[in-house]
Interface confidence: medium
């Protein structure tokens, strides 16, 4: 996932305490464009702007997520925010994918990684197995020390989790191959939620 | 609805280059992977790989590594195949598909093009 | 490579039969498994997924089963329709990979 994801979650952690929580609200009763659900009440309030960019990314996709922030933004009236998202939306050539409603409603969009944050952070406890997988392929050695240096597995998926906003599908994917090989029965029961 | 269209049937020489096109609507581009398979005559299927239009990303199959490269057109909706170096190994239908979801990596392949064959022939 | 290996390669039986392909996976791939079916001439459709699932519009007929390195697929009460080559593929890991197939043909 690429520039769009990155802009907003720059945009989001621009926010004071105060004005993302004034965001969420506005999320919460925001007109959405026809095939697109509405993030849960419960959910969202308590979500950092991590959590919230990877929300708004799996729920929107990049193009229409970008372009939602933007009117929240413009709406809460940080105009020179919304104008930072505008010129990444032309730059990116965003608008153009952003025209169409979700080809297939009842089609899940957004990465598994993406989508299932949180549990994979409560959940996954062979968190060392993980990271041996993404060693080298995805994670610099750097990351990967940083990563172990955390104490627990919860410590340690939150500090990985805050490297894949940079990450690419094939590295998200990387991490996907790996859960499933030592936690298949999480992402199945992940899967089916 | 989704549609995926690939270009025509090619005749090629022994060592020479191919690029097949794949042509897709009715989806956003940029959310979706495309996958490559190819099935050689009375044969089974094979995974080449996948492109992301969205980032760009790619992954092979070891065995199609520096034979096959994925490339893929955001302004014209089109992802492409290039098949270098082709020997009658290479003979074969080339599809491009396009999996049910953007959802993960266990993909199934929902949705495919109709097919290009291509015959290496001096 | 995770290898997958199907049985029979071919099969002959009469209409309205039951009968059932198998896909035994090299090693565990616990419920990413796919079947394709594949009529002459034409693309693979899809069937099922993640070993079980029928997809849209496929007929009730048609099912799958199992888990870790073995799966099933029946299709009872045999249509003249469904003369074609089944094949399964795994999404456990790359690269993924498809059976040889099942061409099934009417007695």
């Known amino acids: 996932m690429g520039r769009a994801r990155d802009a907003i979650l720059d945009a989001l952690e621009n926010l004071s305490g105060d004005e993302l929580k004034k965001f969420k609200m506005k999320l919460l009763t925001v007109q959405l464009r026809e095939g697109y659900g509405r993030i849960p009440r419960g959910a969202l309030l308590q979500m950092d702007a991590i959590d919230l960019t990877d929300k708004l990314v799996s729920y929107y996709l990049e193009s229409y997520g970008l372009e939602l922030t933007m009117t929240v933004l413009r709406d809460m009236g940080l105009q020179e925010l919304a104008e930072q998202l505008q010129t990444t939306k032309e730059e990116s050539g965003a608008v153009a994918a952003a025209a169409s409603v979700p080809a297939q409603s009842t089609a899940r969009t957004g990465h598994f990684v993406d989508q299932h944050r949180q549990a994979l952070i409560a959940r996954v406890t062979e968190v060392d197995g993980v990271l041996d997988a993404l060693h080298g392929s995805v994670l610099t050695e750097g990351q990967y020390q940083a990563v172990r240096a955390e104490t627990t597995s919860q410590d340690k998926m939150r500090k990985l989790f805050s490297f894949v906003p940079s990450w690419n599908l094939t590295c998200k994917d990387s991490l996907l191959q790996a859960l499933k090989e030592i936690h298949p029965y999480l992402v199945m029961d992940l899967e089916q939620s | 609805q989704v549609q995926l269209q690939q270009s025509d049937a090619e005749l090629v020489k022994p060592g020479a280059s191919v690029k097949i096109s794949c042509k897709v609507s009715?989806?956003?581009?940029?959310?979706?992977?495309i996958h490559w398979m190819r099935q050689r005559p009375e044969q089974g299927l094979e995974w080449i790989g996948y492109i992301y239009p969205g980032d760009a990303s790619s992954y092979y199959n070891e065995k199609f590594k520096g034979k096959a490269t994925l490339t893929a057109d955001q302004s014209s909706n089109t992802a492409y195949i290039q098949v270098n170096s082709l020997t009658s190994e290479d003979s074969a239908v080339y599809f491009c598909?396009?999996?049910?979801?953007?959802?993960?990596?266990?993909?199934?392949?929902?949705?495919w093009g109709q097919g290009t064959l291509v015959t290496v022939s001096a | 490579d995770i290898q997958m290996n199907q049985s029979p390669s071919s099969l002959s039986a009469s209409l309205g039969d039951t009968i059932t392909i198998t896909c035994h996976a090299s090693q565990n791939i616990n419920v990413w498994l796919t079947w394709y079916q594949q009529k002459p001439g034409n693309i693979p459709k899809l069937l099922i997924y993640k070993a079980s699932n029928l997809h849209t519009d496929v007929p009730s007929r048609f099912s799958g089963s199992g888990s870790g390195t073995g799966f099933t697929l029946t299709i009872s009460s045999l249509q003249p329709e469904d003369i074609a080559t089944y094949y399964c593929?795994?999404?456990?890991?790359?690269?993924?990979?498809f059976g040889g197939g099942t061409k099934l043909e009417i007695k």
């Open positions: 593929q795994q999404g456990q890991s790359y690269p993924l990979t």
């Open positions: 598909a396009r999996p049910l979801y953007s959802y993960a990596s266990y993909y199934w392949f929902a949705y």
């Open positions: 009715g989806y956003t581009f940029t959310d979706h992977t």
